[in-house]
């Protein structure tokens, strides 16, 4: 995905649908790319990203990536197509309405990633284990 404020040319009129055959509309996501963050050892954090964008492609979802190494903590917020890997990982939770962080194995750093399918859902990133698949909110498969 091309970040906001970078102009692009888009001309494609195929109809995009979700797994149930419903027409998939684009959504609103936080889109600040990589920014330094103070989010650490918290159950949840706000992105503190002031840029919201309508994803260019209807199939794209909101993504957040939290990384911590010896030097700093960063938070990345973007739109991304869940059919394509991001940072070499599949977006397995793309249908969730909430951005529930899951740890991924990356050498030399702590790496968490989440994806979600409700407007601006990557503004609030959740690390707490109390949000698991027993949470009824996560059973809502929504594409808004």
């Amino acid at each position: 995905t091309i970040p906001p404020h970078v102009q692009k040319s888009v001309n494609n009129d195929m109809i995009v649908t979700d797994n149930n055959g419903a027409v998939k509309f684009p959504q609103l996501c936080k889109f600040c790319d990589v920014r330094f963050s103070t989010c650490d050892n918290q159950k949840s954090c706000m992105s503190n990203c002031s840029i919201t964008s309508i994803c260019e492609k209807p199939q794209e979802v909101c993504v957040a990536v939290w990384r911590k190494n010896d030097e700093n903590i960063t938070l990345e917020t973007v739109c991304h197509d869940p059919k394509l890997p991001y940072h070499d990982f599949i977006l397995e939770d793309a249908a969730s309405p909430k951005c529930i962080m899951k740890e991924k194995k990356k050498p030399g750093e702590t790496f968490f990633m989440c994806s979600c399918s409700s407007d601006e859902c990557n503004d609030n990133i959740i690390f707490s284990e109390e949000y698991n698949t027993s949470n009824p909110d996560l059973l809502l498969v929504i594409f808004q």
């Epitope: 906001p4 001309n11 509309f25 492609k57 309405p97 609030n124």
Partner: antibody, heavy 116, light 110 residues
Amino acid sequence: EVQLLESGGGLVQPGGSLRLSCAASGFTFSSYSMSWVRQAPGKGLEWVSWISYNGGSKYYADSVKGRFTISRDNSKNTLYLQMNSLRAEDTAVYYCARRIAAFDYWGQGTLVTVSS
Amino acid sequence: QSVLTQPPSASGTPGQRVTISCTGSSSNIGSNAVSWYQQLPGTAPKLLIYANSHRPSGVPDRFSGSKSGTSASLAISGLRSEDEADYYCGTWDSSLSGYVFGGGTKLTVL
């Protein structure tokens, strides 16, 4: 069939208040973000406000910030717009619409007239 | 003054192709997907194009949308009398943190 039905419009004096409602049916209301859009007589469309599916995030147009409040009751499948300190320039047909990235369904609108 | 600029009027004869432009900036059209809406006289607006160029089901393929840089356009081919309406472009503005519409274009079928 998706339906959005606005109500609560009417004649109000400048400085007065009004609460608009939008009753939604035909879809899982609690799964969708919702918006209010208005249209002054003979004028173009103006976005007013947006609320996320769970009410956790809200945005307002500068022209209504601090005066209007958007809210929702997912148990009643209803969207609200509380309008305070109304001005003559708030006179318009107010539409509720589904989503924000593309307003895919619209209500028929309710007319708000602010006049003394 | 609208954030997005559209021509106030456009016209064409039946069967013709008409294009309506929508010009913005890097903070709106340049970095966000664009939608187009049709408003027939006395009715609520209807979504015509979303995500720059996608048509909702039920919208004829005579309507097409495109976007390049900070401009978008709506093309209507094989113009019909029932296409006479107001057309609005719209998108999010990342600087204003709000949705913005063009001023609207009144299409007349001669």
